[in-house]
């Protein structure tokens, strides 16, 4: 009887070892796949939601004409904000016209009220010129209203219906922009 019990115990232990090994393998596999899965899932979700809803923008993004906008719910410094947008296949907001500025400020008023939101505008340290992240110059009516006194790098942000400037290392919300998908219908 004792022998039978110890045999069963050994079998159970062996099973447990095999399960632990399988779990370890799975954990390793999961870890190596996690990064790729994250992006595949995001891509699939965007694709599927677009396919099902014929939606030009991903969920939780706002559409205006050819653009989709995402208003962040977290604060970050300017450079991290840019990285966060890039992760989503977008860039920080680049305001091309007064109409676009009006849409953005109107939407922000409805969504969140009067907070600071980083946009893709920064000031060249040497020349003092303002440039969008793609290297283009903003139109004259879309230059930050006040010059920041910071000795550090200076970046642009939207607040209420104004474009302002601040030390890039301060923490703010941010707005990402990508192109809206064209409807195939």
């Amino acid at each position: 009887k004792l022998l039978q019990v110890s045999t069963i115990a050994m079998q159970q232990q062996e099973k447990l070892i095999q399960q632990e090994r399988a779990l370890l393998n799975f954990t390793e596999w999961k870890r190596s796949c996690a990064l790729q899965m994250k992006y595949c899932q995001a891509f699939m979700q965007n694709s599927l939601s677009s396919a099902h809803n014929s939606s030009p923008c991903p969920n939780n993004w706002i559409q205006n004409r050819e653009s989709c906008y995402y208003v962040s719910e977290i604060w970050s410094i300017w450079h991290t904000s840019q990285e966060n947008c890039l992760k989503e296949g977008s860039t920080l907001l680049q305001i091309e016209s007064k109409e676009e500025m009006d849409f953005i400020t109107g939407s922000l008023r409805k969504i969140k009220g009067s907070y600071d939101y980083w946009v893709g505008l920064s000031q060249d340290g040497h020349s003092g010129r303002w440039l969008w992240q793609d290297g283009s110059s903003p139109s004259p009516g879309l230059l930050p209203a006040e010059r920041s006194q910071s000795a550090n790098q200076v970046c642009g942000y939207v607040k209420s219906n104004s474009l302002l400037s601040s030390n890039c290392s301060t923490w703010k919300y941010f707005i990402c922009e990508k192109y809206a998908l064209r409807s195939s219908v």
Partner: nanobody
Framework: QVQLQESGGGLVQPGGSLRLSCAAS????????MGWYRQAPGKQRELVAA???????AYADSVKGRFTISRDNAKNTVYLQMNSLKPEDTAVYYC???????WGQGTQVTVSS
């Protein structure tokens, strides 16, 4: 296994040009964004330029007007054309996807007379 292979680095005089290439294996390439980063000795890795799958572009202030990023989805390759190079551009250049902590072996760019 996804692999990133950077090439095109070298020694160049100030004012010179180089074109870096990054070939990516795997079908992830066309999703979201790809970027060029650089790391100089004793400094943190920094984003130099990035391009999204839609062709939206972002450059670091220090390279605006001098560097141009582009991508060829058919070849799974992203390029960095570097003109008017300066000694402060000396670094190891890596390509990668923003937010995705995976890198190739990098390519050394040295700007010196």
């Amino acid at each position: 296994q996804v692999q990133l292979q950077e090439s095109g680095g070298g020694l160049v005089q100030p004012g010179g040009s180089l074109r870096l290439s990054c070939a990516a294996s795997g079908s992830f390439f066309s999703i979201n964004a790809m970027g060029w980063y650089r790391q100089a000795p004793g400094k943190q890795r920094e984003l130099v330029a990035a391009i999204t799958n839609q062709g939206r572009i972002a450059y670091a202030d220090s390279v605006k007007g001098r560097f141009t990023i582009s991508r060829d989805n058919a070849k799974n390759t992203v390029y960095l054309q570097m003109n008017s190079l300066k000694p402060e551009d000396t670094a190891v250049y890596y390509c990668g996807r923003p937010g995705w902590d995976y890198w190739g072996q990098g390519t050394q760019v040295t700007v010196s007379s």
